[in-house]
Interface confidence: low
């Protein structure tokens, strides 16, 4: 069954290829214009909003924009987006977000009565995710993303843990293969890091890097497969 | 709910978040007139009101948000018939990756219009 | 919007196809994502980057395709499954939708 999703921009409307195609069709037009606002760091960007999590819009005086890895505690920064999930830009300086920020809350997104001042219509509008008046009712658990808030690794969505930063927990991604990661030393030793790792993923351990050109002294850990 | 509408008076929707960092996701409006498809209206991210607006509404919504209550709205300006539809908020699920899908819906609002 | 009827247990075939590519190449991740919406209800995210189950989404629904042409499978269709099913590109600004399918 077929659902076509016909760009505007090549000159077959969505209700032409849907006249054309067989069985089901989902017209999905693009819009008329080029320029929209694409995603990922292989493009250029306008605004922080436009990168990856865990990058930043960087526009240098000469040269294209492009999305950069964000800084971390106590690194220089101009603004909040600059910083990495669980820091902020104080001063220039991004630093950690006060747990009370990081507070993780109940999900919900409620309807209120609004008015409106210009025109004095009144709406009511219930746009909830739960009914905040009945504390029984089933309410759907926001899975944390990445720097969102979280107690247990279950309350980030998958690919994710949620592991200590600072004196807060937020959702950090799993380790892949290649990645630094962080042996453990003795049984419960994860509560004594201030930035702890997420463990490697699935079908990967932490083992030494040995490699002849780093220092032996050092003992790198990286994630590598089984 | 459900809102009847005059026909040239303007409506405010409203869409209260909780949950989550307000301020780390885009918050997208999507119009779903009865018996028809999904068509997004525009999205706004609360950090610092950035708009992006389906052209075709560009002369009819508005948004807005209230950071202290971690609220967004939508004005509708100059209501016909056509604007009789369900109203959508909708978070931008951030999904590990940045991404423009939509992971949490608000329950909708249906507005009619007429007099 | 398109309609199919189908009897539980049977397995469904939904596709979609963009005239341009949805692929990011710096992560090769496809930006098409697929919604559920029942009578009377919001839309519900059940797969994004083509082929991401989203969390809690029963593993009959899979989404797979690359580029320019995706698909979402329903595995052993459930009475629970009637409903619209929506594709999604979250790749670019203005976002869209398909017109939809009607599983009936």
């Known amino acids: 069954k077929l659902n076509s999703i016909k760009s505007s921009l090549g000159g077959e409307t969505p209700a032409q290829s849907a006249n054309r195609s067989a069985g089901m069709n989902q017209g999905l037009a693009f819009g008329g214009s080029k320029k929209g606002k694409s995603l990922g760091q292989a493009y250029p960007c306008s605004s922080d909003k436009e990168c990856e999590v865990g990058r930043y819009c960087h526009s240098p005086h000469q040269g294209s924009s492009a999305c950069m890895l964000c800084r971390r505690k106590k690194k220089r920064c101009h603004r909040d987006g600059m910083c990495c999930p669980g820091t902020r830009c104080n001063n220039g300086i991004c630093i950690p977000v006060t747990e009370s920020i990081l507070t993780p809350h109940i999900p919900a997104l409620d309807g209120t009565r609004h008015r409106d001042r210009n025109h004095g219509h009144y709406s009511n509008h219930d746009l909830g995710w739960q009914n905040l008046g009945r504390p029984h009712s089933k309410m759907p658990h926001i899975k944390g993303h990445e720097g969102d808030p979280c107690l247990r690794s279950s309350d980030c969505i998958d690919g994710f843990c949620c592991a200590r930063h600072f004196w807060t927990k937020i959702c950090k991604p799993v380790l892949h293969q290649g990645e630094v990661c962080t042996k453990q030393r003795k049984k419960g030793s994860h509560g004594l890091e201030i930035f702890q790792r997420c463990d490697c993923a699935k079908g990967l351990s932490c083992k030494v890097w040995k490699d002849a050109t780093y220092s032996s002294k050092a003992r790198l850990h990286v994630c590598q497969k089984i | 709910g459900a809102e009847l509408v005059r026909p040239g008076a303007s409506v405010k929707l409203s869409c209260k978040a909780s949950?989550?960092?307000?301020?780390?996701?885009?918050m997208n409006w999507v119009k779903q007139r009865p018996g028809q498809g999904l068509e997004w209206i525009g999205m706004?991210?609360?950090?610092?009101?950035?708009?992006r607006l389906n052209q075709k509404f560009k002369d009819k919504a508005t948004l807005t948000v209230d950071k202290s209550s971690s609220t967004a709205y939508m004005q509708l300006s100059s209501p016909t018939s056509e604007d009789s539809a369900v109203y959508y908020c909708a978070r931008e699920g951030r999904l590990g990756l940045r991404s423009y899908a939509m992971d949490y819906w608000g329950q909708g609002t249906s507005v009619t219009v007429s007099s | 919007p398109s309609s199919l009827a189908m009897s539980v247990g049977q397995k469904v075939t939904m596709s979609c196809k963009s005239s341009q590519s949805l692929l990011n190449s710096s992560n090769q991740k496809n930006y098409l994502a697929w919604y559920q919406q029942k009578p009377g209800q919001s839309p519900k995210l059940l797969v994004y980057f083509a082929s991401t189950r989203e969390s809690g989404v029963p593993d009959r629904f899979v989404g797979s395709g690359s580029g320019t042409d995706f698909t979402l499978t329903i595995t052993s269709v459930q009475a629970e499954d009637l409903a619209d099913y929506f594709c999604?590109?979250?790749?670019?600004?203005?976002?869209?939708f398909g017109a939809g399918t009607k599983l009936e």
């Open positions: 949950g989550y960092s307000f301020t780390n996701y885009w």
């Open positions: 999604q590109q979250h790749y670019i600004t203005p976002l869209t």
């Open positions: 706004i991210h609360p950090s610092d009101s950035e708009t």
